[in-house]
């Protein structure tokens, strides 16, 4: 549109002037006036601002509290917040990753469909027919039943979703 119907994209209106916003990594010290430019200052150590802004205070970097099972995945800069993740064997309880919980284990009869990450829990699936899991584990998939035939054996005890088949020698009396 011509002429402009608002201040430009990186500006804000104050006292009849369109002033420049402060760029990411800087905070506002004083608004521009008819005589002066917008005054901005870099954020201090352990502070950040991630957008063009008119904030008078920078935000504190997130603290990755080891007591909550957290560790730093990516150190913050003046323009970005610190990114936390969880220690090995744990995962975040929320997208913001403010605390961690132990990865869930898949019970006997269930296998791991997807191994947990720092941000997602273990995904379990029931062992289908022909597969079993006899342990509680955060890593083990369902295992296929042993094939007695390939060992020249016969099934003596049928498998379940929690147990393997039991193979035994063929009955020689049978023709």
């Amino acid at each position: 549109p011509e002429p402009p119907t608002a201040c430009r994209e990186k500006q804000y209106l104050i006292n009849s002037q369109c002033c420049s916003l402060c760029q990411p990594g800087q905070k506002l010290v004083s608004d521009c006036t008819e005589f002066t430019e917008t005054e901005c200052l870099p954020c201090g150590e352990s502070e950040f601002l991630d957008t063009w802004n008119r904030e008078t205070h920078c935000h504190q970097h997130k603290y990755c509290d080891p007591n909550l099972g957290l560790r730093v995945q990516q150190k913050g800069t003046s323009e970005t917040d610190t990114i936390c993740t969880c220690e090995e064997g744990w995962h975040c309880t929320s997208e913001a990753c403010e605390s961690c919980v132990l990865h869930r284990s898949c019970s006997p009869g269930f296998g791991v469909k997807q191994i947990a990450t720092g941000v997602s829990d273990t995904i379990c699936e029931p062992c289908p027919v022909g597969f079993f899991s006899n342990v509680s584990s955060a890593f083990e998939k369902c295992h296929p039943w042993t094939s007695c035939e390939t060992k020249d054996l016969v099934v003596q005890q049928a498998g379940t979703n929690k147990t393997d088949v039991v193979c035994g020698p063929q009955d020689r009396l049978r023709a």
Partner: antibody, heavy 125, light 107 residues
Framework: QVQLVQSGAEVKKPGASVKVSCKAS????????MYWVRQAPGQGLEWMGW????????TYAQKFQGRVTMTRDTSISTAYMELSRLRSDDTAVYYC??????????????????WGQGTLVTVSS | DIQLTQSPSFLSASVGDRVTITCRAS??????LAWYQQKPGKAPKLLIY???TLQSGVPSRFSGSGSGTEFTLTISSLQPEDFATYYC?????????FGQGTKVEIK
């Protein structure tokens, strides 16, 4: 204080191209649109277009469409104006100018509050 | 394009004189008008924007008025440093055209 410092004078042959730079200091470069205006010897001022230094998007006056290219490098707070297929009537002083916007009576009024010192481009065979 | 016609093109005046320059637009431009002063070999300098608002640092002897199609720049008491060329500019419709200029000379 706000300063716009332009590159030095250029002499070019007809058909050639020229690229003029305008280095800004004393303010947040990406916060204000930058305009280009030229002035032929002994003549008036002619508006060529502008660039949004944040996005890099330019708008050109119809007269210069296809011959002018306005760019910027935000890392060094510098705007550029390149004019191609030069003719003798392109001989002029080329200025960069910063836009200011004033709000009053419900309207937004633009004007050019700071200008570069000008770059003389002479086109001669 | 919107045409701006300044009158007079040349003006001879003495120090202390009251000087008025007129700028006429070929169509209505509301108050989207600015005035600039230019001295030989120098860049233009903003004097007035929004037709009548004085730019900071510009002496109060300069004033602007008008709206629509007729505008004036007035220098209430001409000073030696005011001898220059003055341009009006419309900022209503692209391209943002300038008047042809008014040269104020010493009588």
């Amino acid at each position: 204080q706000v300063q716009l410092v332009q590159s030095g004078a250029e002499v070019k042959k007809p058909g050639a191209s020229v690229k003029v730079s305008c280095k800004a200091s004393g303010y947040t470069f990406a916060g204000y649109y930058m305009y280009w205006v030229r002035q032929a010897p002994g003549q008036g001022l002619e508006w060529m277009g502008w660039i949004n230094p944040d996005s890099g998007a330019p708008t050109y006056a119809q007269k210069f469409q296809g011959r002018v290219t306005m760019t910027r490098d935000t890392s060094i707070s510098t705007a550029y104006m390149e004019l191609s297929r030069l003719r003798s009537d392109d001989t002029a002083v080329y200025y960069c100018a910063r836009e200011k916007i004033y709000y009053g009576s419900g309207n937004y009024y633009p004007s050019f509050d700071y200008w570069g010192q000008g770059t003389l481009v002479t086109v001669s065979s | 394009d919107i045409q701006l016609t300044q009158s007079p093109s040349f003006l001879s005046a003495s120090v202390g004189d009251r000087v008025t320059i007129t700028c006429r637009a070929s169509q209505g431009i509301s108050s989207y008008l600015a005035w600039y002063q230019q001295k030989p070999g120098k860049a233009p300098k903003l004097l007035i924007y929004a037709a009548s608002t004085l730019q900071s640092g510009v002496p109060s002897r300069f004033s602007g008025s008008g709206s629509g199609t007729e505008f004036t720049l007035t220098i209430s008491s001409l000073q030696p440093e005011d001898f220059a060329t003055y341009y009006c500019q419309q900022l209503m419709s692209y391209p943002w055209t300038f008047g042809q200029g008014t040269k104020v000379e010493i009588k």
